[in-house]
């Protein structure tokens, strides 16, 4: 049905590759391994995706259903303020932080948490159903 279609956004096509979970108009990958923040980002890029950028509270709430107490890296960093990897500011949720050295963002079922970027954690990647479509 979707072959040959050229969508300008991530809409309409139902399929995600193996190992990816479809929710809404995107595909999500929840890692089985643990890496530091930078290596998690590189993993996602090497699979033609991005470390998870959450667009709104609705997406965050729905993703948290799939999470446990364990934290997962997401595409959120503190560079003079918390920003997503697409450059947008974090403006729909609070993030807990215990120290100024915790400059990378993670998520679990309870919310967002700052962490030292060197800690190995699980991670979440996000992409469009087709690799030739830009996520942002």
């Amino acid at each position: 049905l979707c072959q040959g279609s050229n969508y300008s956004t991530c809409a309409s096509c139902p399929s995600c590759p193996d190992r990816w979970m479809k929710y809404g108009n995107h595909c999500y990958y929840f890692s089985v391994e643990e890496k530091d923040w930078n290596s998690s980002l590189e993993f996602c890029l090497a699979r033609d995706s991005h470390l998870l950028v959450i667009t709104d509270n609705q997406e965050m709430s729905l993703l948290q259903v799939f999470l446990s107490e364990a934290f997962c890296w997401i595409g959120l960093r503190n560079n003079s303020g918390w920003r997503w990897e697409d450059g947008s500011p974090l403006n729909f949720s609070r993030i807990s932080s215990n120290s100024f050295v915790q400059t990378c963002g993670a998520i679990n079922k309870n919310g967002l948490q700052a962490s030292s970027c060197e800690v190995p954690l699980h991670w979440v990647c996000k992409k469009c159903p087709f690799a030739d479509q830009a996520l942002f």
Epitope: R19, E34, S39, A46, R47, V119
Partner: antibody
């Protein structure tokens, strides 16, 4: 059976160039990120490049950035490593490796192709 | 990058003997460690991934374990084909880094 077969190695002068190739079979090549790893004459192993499934993203350690370029042709199941401005310290056996999809580094290795940089 | 210190660099042992090789990471890498085997012809094969999971086809005499930032590969009863080179590889943090290798020799 997963197979990775490298070619293109040889003797090259310092400052010279060389292009290595790797032909993959036994798996769906376009679904895997791929890497090159080298082994020095002293047997030290060193990761030198990774490329994404589609070829849109590359990653290199700092010591080879700008001199080594990884690329791929998914239609031909081929992986490449273009090497330029070669130095004696680039002398090594170069291995084509498949990246474990789940992120557990390299799961299959080729037999290697030897590169010697010497005047 | 993370330094992986592998020991011993060489080890002499007898057929049937139990041996352990160790890699120490310079910082926390969780369970993100592989063990590789290299034959004399240069062929490299992954034996163990994620610290303790055996790759398919790898004999059960091989096992992996972890204590803090120390990682061990144990061969419970050495066979003739085990007398080759072994390397560890961490993949928690880019750049991926390898141990210096252990050459296992027959006594």
């Amino acid at each position: 059976e997963v197979q990775l077969v490298e070619s293109g190695g040889g003797l090259v002068k310092p400052g010279g160039s060389l292009k290595l190739s790797c032909t993959a079979s036994g798996f769906t090549f376009r679904n895997y990120a791929m890497s090159w790893v080298r082994q020095t004459p002293e047997k030290r192993l060193e990761w030198v490049a990774t490329i994404s499934e589609s070829g849109n993203y590359n990653n290199y350690p700092d010591n080879v950035k700008g001199r080594l370029t990884i690329s791929r042709d998914n239609a031909k199941n081929n992986l490449y490593l273009q090497m330029s401005l070669l130095k004696s310290e680039d002398t090594a056996m170069y291995y084509c490796v498949r990246d474990d999809w789940e992120g557990r580094a390299m799961d299959y290795w080729g037999q290697g192709t030897s590169v010697t940089v010497s005047s | 990058g993370i330094q992986m210190t592998q020991s011993p660099s060489s080890l002499s042992a007898s057929l049937g003997e139990r041996v352990s090789l160790t890699c120490r990471a310079s910082r926390d890498i969780g369970s993100s460690l592989n063990w590789l085997q290299q034959k004399p012809d240069g062929t490299i094969k992954r034996l163990i991934y994620a610290t303790s999971s055996l790759d398919s086809g790898v004999p059960k005499r091989f096992s992996g374990s972890r204590s803090g930032t120390d990682y061990s590969l144990t061969i419970s009863s050495l066979e003739s084909e085990d007398f080759v080179d072994y390397f560890c590889l961490q993949y928690a943090s880019s750049p991926w880094t390898f141990g210096g290798g252990t050459k296992l020799e027959i006594k």
